[in-house]
Structures are given as C-alpha cells and as structure tokens.
C-alpha cells in the first residue's frame, strides 16, 4: 500500500470541487453555467437500464474531466485524473487506524473467491439497510443476501469488475477498512489473469454510511475497454434486483427463485483511468418515507405508493418485491388516499396466495435473471471464512495459503 | 477584448513582502480557476499557484508553500498573489493566467518583474 | 510531482524544415499534455491542449501527438515566425509542471 496521491494539496478533506476537470477542474462547472453547453453537444455516459439512457453534462469539445449523470437512484460525478478532487477520494488506507484495516488473506491468495463481512453500519444501497457485504478478487462487491453462482449478474458494487487474480503475487492484496461511517475495500496491485505483463492494478471502492458510493482508481496500467470479458465479465457501475418466487414448471409444488434486476448503472469504460473517481451520490426512494403521507405526498421521479398492510412506501421496484406483490400491495394501493386507511388494522393481513408476481409493469421494465436456466457467467466461488480465519489484521506482507472452496 | 493585466511589481529586499495583482476582463472572470506562473531571468516557467473559480480552493508549489497566498476578488475581477518572506530565488516575472476550458492556460497577462536584492 | 524533461533543449532549422520537439513525463499523464510557444519578452501562448488539440487561432502546421509519457509537437514547415521556444506543461495533477524549454533557432 503506498502513500496518497497528489501530496500537497492545501484542501480540507472533503471539500466539493465543482469543476469541468483537469486544468478546468479550477473553474466553475458547466451545469452552473448553463450557456456553456449546448443539447447537440451532449453525449451519453452510462446506461440506465431502469429508465433509459440519460444525457449528461459534457463541452462541446467532448473533454470534460468531470462528468455528472442523474440515474434516478443515484448521481454520479466522475472526475478525470487531472481533477483534484479525484485525489481527495481516495482513501489512504496505509495512513488508517491498523485496528480498522485487514488485509483479507484468503482473497489475497486465490482467484475467483469471495468472502462475507459484517459492516459496523447499516449501508444504504438503493435505500435498503444492508449489514453484510461479499468481497470478491474480481474487483466487485457483491450486495445481495442469497449467494449464487452468479455473483457478477447483478447486485454489486463494481470498481472494476474483471478477471483478477490475486494468487498470482505476494504483492497483491485484497484489503478493507472499516472506521465506522465508511467501509472501503481496495484491490492492491492485482493483476489480471493471462493480462499480467500489462501491470498491476490499483483501485477501491467506499461505501459511506450516508449511502454514497465511491470509486477511485490509482493504477490502471490499460486501457479497460481492451480488457478482455470472455472469462470474466467486465463491468463498472452498480447493479441491483430483487428476488421472486413463482412456481416451478417442472416441479408445481416448488418454487423458483427468480432474479429481476430493476436497475443498473453503467460507467464508460474508458472513463476509468489511472487516477479518476467516480462518486454515486444516492437520490431519495420511496422507501424512505415512513408515513402514507410523505409517501403520497412525495414529488419524487418515482411513482411511490404506500401499502397499509406492510406499512412501507414503495415504487414496486425494490428488494421487497415479493411481500409487495404476496400481500396485495400494488392492488391496494390503487385510487386509494390516506384518509382511506384511517381505521384498517394492518396487524391482520396475510399474503394473497392468488396473485400473480408476474404483473405486466414487471416485464417490460426490468431485465429478468434467472438463476436455474442462465449459463453460469462466473465461477466465483464463496469463502465461508467471514471472520479472523481469513483475515490479518496488520499491513505485514501476505503469507501464502490453500484456499477453501466452497461450491454455490 | 479578453485580457490580464499583472501590476505591483518591483524591487524588494529579501524577507519582506509583496503584493501583486492582475486585473481581468473580457470574460466571466467568476467562471474561471486563476494561475500564477513565474519565470526567473534567463530561465524556464515554473507553475507557482491556482485558486478555484470561487476562490475557496487553492494549490501551491513546494517552493513557495507557506510563504504565498493566492487569493481574488470575484466583484472586482481581480486576482491576487501575496507574496512573504521573500527570497532571492523568488525573483522573476510573474504572470497569470486563465485556466482554459479545454485544457492549459489559454490568456496571459504580460507579466510584472519582482525582483529580491539586498 | 511530475517532471516533464523536453529534447532537444535547442536546434537550428531552417525556414520551412519540419522541426520535432519531444517532450516526457516522469509517470503517465494519460492526455493531459499542453504545448506554448513563447518569444523574447512576451507571455507564452498556448498551441496544443490536450495533446493533440489545436488552440484556437493557432495556425494548422502546428500538432500534436502521443499519450501516456511521451509527447511531441511537430511543425510541418517553419515559419519565420516560429523561431521561439516551446515549452511542453502536464495538466494531469497539480503542481503543472513545465518542461525546460526547446529553444528553437535559426540555421
């Protein structure tokens, strides 16, 4: 782990810089200028598979270093290597409370492995609450609950997500941090597996207690649209889902776990360089208002409902899909106005075993997965050792082990 | 036109102090992160200061860190460089610079000489 | 910080010669790569940004190339007005360092 970047700065840590990037990265940006660009000159960032694609800020010239996108659940700001912003997020491990840091052994010393940890906060992912994260080599968090064997399909947090392997160097090394209001995972000096003459990789991601999200990359030795997918898949951005049951054709008394993923963020590619970052600022969600009122009542760009029954505020798109849909919510819901549930007790209800969870907003707005049927897209494997087995809770070089695997 | 004009140089004995400043116009001087640039008789231009468009951010050069405050005034369009505990190395021409929207410095002034002898 | 060494430090051409300035820098500064050309007396101008991106104003035989450490400006056919020296800045992290300077004269 070397030092910080870009020693010398004179900011206080955390300031916002409001800038277009490198040289520019002193000047006012473009969206508070708003003369400055043009619709012509627009051009797409990423994709947002929950509401399409979505224009962004750019000058005319294309070079903008600092680059804002809206994506419904999150904004992200993604700042060029020149921007010195970039260098205030990233997150000095090696300068960190040894007590916080732990050098992730295990991960350090395999490929395709991935291992849970218990956060010391409840991190806001898409405005849920979640306790556990899965580290894997693969330069990717995973942030689902059930493991699977397609832990890069969707809910993660991807930096970089690629094919790494760790084992390949006693210099490389999977470590995370954790000082209580921000959890960070870095990827130090990875290489690629059958790419490793190209150089190692440095990177990290942060996940922040106020639910932000950051990527920051230090060494990026290629250029990442060259890297190769047909192992491993490539990606970088956020992804979640939710899960639903439905009947098993084969089986009628079984159910059949499906994955939908409602949405995904998708950075360029070739926007990750050697010293950028990528900041995901979370957008307010319906499962934020814990009153009917602040739920109807809510001017977000989601159309929020409130259940009664559940008592939760929702879009319909969320992790809880399947309560929202077993107990009737989305009929519920329908033309009703607060006033209408005064006197419901919503202790009583149970799921409506009758309804569908295939309702028609569901196929044409989401990507399904399915779990059972699709062709396994990566192998990664689960470490059952989340605690001190696997872990060294020093900055002292790795020391080589046999890894568990345990097969999902 | 767009255009920087430096004033407040001159002759200084070494340790004391310096004001210089560089009148903008032309442009949005509030839209803009300012440089100072300097560059020693005979010698090659050496980067000294930047401060964000806002004037809340600043970044020095190792050899004038402590001793120089980059500093504007957005309502007057004017940018600032005060300079303490000066030295003889300090001596130089002194230009700002407009940080460009592409990329670089894309407006000069014509420089103002300050120069440190006892 | 990032040093940014140029080469040659001077040469001589001759009115119409393609003249090639190189400049490198200490670690990868990806594009981020300025070119100015400055004449006695006077504030240096900006040519190149970006690398390769031609200032406004900046007359057509001036370009530039390359990305990551190794950078160069070339002058298709020098003009008398060329003769200067050029200077080669990073743009990629603060301090903006400059190259030396190549100082370009006549044969």
């Known amino acids: 782990l070397s030092p910080q970047p870009g020693a010398g700065h004179d900011e206080g840590p955390g300031s916002g810089w409001a800038a277009k990037g490198t040289v520019r990265g002193w000047n006012r940006r473009a969206r508070e200028s708003p003369g400055h660009v043009s619709e012509p000159d627009r051009t797409q960032l990423s994709q947002d598979l929950g509401g399409g694609t979505l224009a962004m800020d750019t000058l005319p010239d294309n070079r903008t270093r600092v680059v804002e996108d809206n994506h419904s659940y999150y904004v992200s700001r993604l700042y060029g290597p020149s921007e010195p912003h970039s260098r205030e997020l990233w997150v000095d491990v090696a300068e960190a409370n040894r007590s916080q840091v732990k050098i992730h052994t295990i991960l350090s010393n395999t490929h395709r492995q991935a291992s849970r940890v218990v956060l010391s906060f409840d991190f806001p992912f898409y405005g849920h609450p979640l306790r556990q994260i899965t580290i894997a080599t693969g330069g990717f968090i995973f942030m689902g609950d059930v493991i699977h064997r397609m832990l890069t399909a969707t809910q993660y947090v991807a930096p970089l997500m690629a094919n790494f392997n760790p084992g390949y160097s006693d210099n490389s090394t999977v470590v995370y941090f954790d000082n209580g209001t921000v959890f960070v995972v870095q990827w130090d000096h990875v290489y690629l597996q059958g790419w490793e003459d190209k150089g190692s990789f440095t990177f990290q991601a942060a996940l922040h207690h106020d639910g932000r999200i950051v990527f920051a990359y230090k060494e990026i030795p290629m250029s990442v649209p060259e890297i190769s997918s047909s192992q491993h898949p490539v990606k970088t951005g956020l992804s979640d889902a939710f899960m639903i049951l439905n009947p098993s054709p084969d089986v009628p008394e079984s159910r059949r776990r499906s994955i939908f993923e409602y949405h995904r963020i998708e950075l360029d590619p070739s926007k990750v360089t050697s010293m950028s970052a990528v900041e995901f600022t979370p957008l307010p969600t319906c499962l934020q208002h814990r009153s009917c009122d602040a739920c109807m009542s809510s001017d977000l760009t989601f159309n929020c409902s409130w259940c009664h029954v559940l008592q939760r505020c929702s879009s319909g798109f969320d992790r809880y899909r399947q309560e929202w849909m077993d107990y009737g919510c989305a009929q519920e819901a329908e033309g009703r106005m607060c006033e209408d549930f005064q006197d419901e007790d919503h202790d009583s209800a149970s799921p409506d075993t009758s309804f569908s969870p295939y309702d028609g907003d569901l196929t044409t707005t989401s990507s399904s997965l399915f779990i059972d049927s699709l062709t396994t897209e990566d192998d990664t494997k689960l470490n059952p050792y989340a605690g001190g087995d696997g872990l060294q809770n020093n900055l002292s070089p790795k020391t080589k082990g046999t890894p568990v695997h345990l097969g999902t | 036109q767009v255009q920087l004009v430096e004033s407040g140089g001159g002759v200084v004995q070494p340790g004391r102090s310096l004001r210089l400043s560089c009148a903008a116009s032309?442009?949005?001087?509030?839209?803009?992160?300012m440089h100072w640039v300097r560059q020693a008789p005979g010698k090659g231009l050496e980067w000294v200061a930047v401060?964000?468009?806002?004037?809340?951010?600043?970044y020095y050069a190792d050899s004038v860190k402590g001793r120089f405050t980059i500093s504007r005034d957005n309502s007057k369009n004017t940018l600032y460089l005060q300079m303490n505990s000066l030295r003889a190395e300090d001596t130089a021409v002194y230009y700002c610079?407009?940080?460009?929207?592409?990329?670089?410095?894309?407006?000069w002034g014509q420089g103002t000489l300050v120069t440190v002898s006892s | 910080d990032i040093q940014m060494t140029q080469s040659p430090s001077s040469l001589s051409a001759s009115v119409g010669d393609r003249v090639t300035i190189t400049c490198r820098a200490s670690q990868t500064i990806s594009n981020y790569l300025n070119w100015y050309q400055q004449k006695p007396g006077k504030a240096p101008k900006l040519l190149i940004y970006?690398?390769?991106s031609l200032q406004s104003g900046v007359p057509s035989r001036f370009s530039g190339s390359g990305s990551g450490t190794d950078f160069t400006l070339t002058i298709s056919s020098l003009q008398p007005e060329d003769f200067a020296t050029y200077y080669c800045q990073q743009s990629y992290s603060p301090p903006y360092t400059f190259g030396q300077g190549t100082k370009v004269e006549i044969k």
């Open positions: 970006a690398a390769s």
């Open positions: 032309g442009f949005i001087f509030s839209d803009y992160g």
């Open positions: 610079a407009r940080g460009s929207e592409g990329d670089g410095f894309d407006v």
């Open positions: 401060i964000s468009y806002e004037g809340s951010r600043e």
